[in-house]
């Protein structure tokens, strides 16, 4: 009796179970009672990443420089090309089909984690004792200047956006 289901890595056609083509190969002709499934390797710049019965391989993704994309990993007959973003940009999605510039941390915030090709800058508020007076994609919060170590005194308190202002100690006695 003809099968109604086939084993893994097989497919049903004309009441017969045929072997699927392995990753990196496409289907040329189905098996018959007397012949095996005929498969052919994908050509350069094409791929198939699963056991399949596709008659055409897929084209590798094009990492379009117009969009700020570049090749992170060249595709093979079994894998697609992996794109990433140029320096200063990061992907807008996991599939990395477009890029946006890295976010800068505003004054009062410092960089907690520098951006990569796939993730944006992570900013954090400068805690007490630290400040950032610039908008930057790479600068961390900096500690306030220690006036005491310079034998000076604080003339103006620091904020999350400004450093303390040090000045000479008042030597006049009452």
């Amino acid at each position: 009796e003809p099968p109604t289901a086939c084993r893994e890595k097989q497919y049903l056609i004309n009441s017969q179970c045929c072997s699927l083509c392995q990753p990196g190969q496409k289907l040329v002709s189905d098996c018959t009672e007397f012949t095996e499934t005929e498969c052919l390797p994908c050509s350069e710049s094409e791929f198939l990443d699963t056991w399949n019965r596709e008659t055409r391989c897929h084209q590798h993704k094009y990492c379009d420089p117009n969009l700020g994309l570049q090749v992170q990993q060249k595709g093979t007959s079994e894998t697609d090309t992996i794109c990433t973003c140029e320096e200063g940009l990061h992907c807008t999605s996991e599939s990395c089909e477009s890029c946006v510039p890295h976010r800068s941390c505003l004054p009062g915030f410092g960089v907690k984690q520098i951006a990569t090709g796939v993730s944006d800058t992570i900013c954090e508020p400068c805690p007490v004792g630290f400040f950032s007076n610039v908008s930057s994609a790479f600068e961390k919060c900096r500690p306030w200047t220690s006036c005491e170590t310079k034998d000076l005194v604080v003339q103006q308190a620091g904020t999350n956006k400004t450093d303390v202002v040090c000045g000479p100690q008042d030597r006049q006695r009452a």
Epitope: S45, N66, L67, G68, V71, E87, G88
Partner: antibody, heavy 129, light 112 residues
Framework: QVQLVESGGGVVQPGRSLRLSCAAS????????MHWVRQAPGKGLEWVAV????????YHADSVWGRFTISRDNSRSTLYLQMNSLRAEDTAVYYC??????????????????????WGQGTTVTVSS | DIVMTQSPLSLPVTPGEPASISCRSS???????????LDWYLQKPGQSPQLLIY???NRASGVPDRFSGSGSGTDFTLKISRVEAEDVGVYYC?????????FGQGTKVEIK
């Protein structure tokens, strides 16, 4: 001066193959992405294929995919289009074109795209029995 | 694929008069960096195409300032402030946002 010169066109029978070449001069070929664009007699422009500056990344129009292959030899400053299983509808003038760009520094390509800024004179391919 | 539609397909012009060509895309060509990835090309009779405008509104090197490009998103316009006899030919818009690149059908500009 900056120049692109196509060659390799001719009359060929359906099902046969042809290889077009595009010789570049006057600029650093290996720094530029390159395109093939074609124009059937009396028709508009049709984009065919693109290849990255290093040749690692390429893409073909659906109408030619699986039959045509774009490639390049940077040591010879030459772009190629290998055309197999030719059809009557592939009859056209084939142009190579350079993807213009500006700064090669950080974010250069992203912020400085200059269109297809240099085109060859074209080479004619006629597919006929 | 992005479909590019030009109008008019034929444009008879008088030298010295202005001319305008429209190009519409099936999806927005405005990218995250604020640029519109649309180019304009001119193919003069018997010649190869030549770049006129890139990124929607930037004139290519050597292009006379009577040519200007405008628009954003899906609607773009190429204007010639005062047409000259040498401006005859077929004008094409092309989107550069997606692979495959796609061209408009072309607008044939001829002297009346």
């Amino acid at each position: 001066q900056v120049q692109l010169v196509e060659s390799g066109g001719g009359v060929v029978q359906p099902g046969r193959s042809l290889r077009l070449s595009c010789a570049a001069s006057g600029f650093t070929f290996s720094s530029y992405g390159m395109h093939w664009v074609r124009q059937a007699p009396g028709k508009g422009l049709e984009w065919v294929a693109v290849i990255s500056n290093d040749g690692d990344n390429k893409y073909h129009a659906d109408s030619v995919w699986g039959r045509f292959t774009i490639s390049r030899d940077n040591s010879r400053s030459t772009l190629y289009l290998q055309m197999n299983s030719l059809r009557a509808e592939d009859t056209a003038v084939y142009y190579c074109a350079r993807r213009g760009m500006g700064s090669s520094g950080s974010r250069g390509d992203y912020y400085y795209y200059y269109g297809l800024d240099v085109w060859g004179q074209g080479t004619t391919v006629t597919v006929s029995s | 694929d992005i479909v590019m539609t030009q109008s008019p397909l034929s444009l008879p012009v008088t030298p010295g008069e202005p001319a305008s060509i429209s190009c519409r895309s099936s999806q927005s060509l405005l990218y995250s960096n604020g640029y519109n990835f649309l180019d304009w090309y001119l193919q003069k009779p018997g010649q190869s195409p030549q770049l006129l405008i890139y990124l929607g509104s930037n004139r290519a090197s050597g292009v006379p300032d009577r040519f200007s490009g405008s628009g954003s998103g899906t609607d773009f316009t190429l204007k010639i402030s005062r047409v000259e006899a040498e401006d005859v030919g077929v004008y094409y818009c092309m989107q550069a946002l997606q692979t495959p690149r796609t061209f408009g059908q072309g607008t044939k500009v001829e002297i009346k």
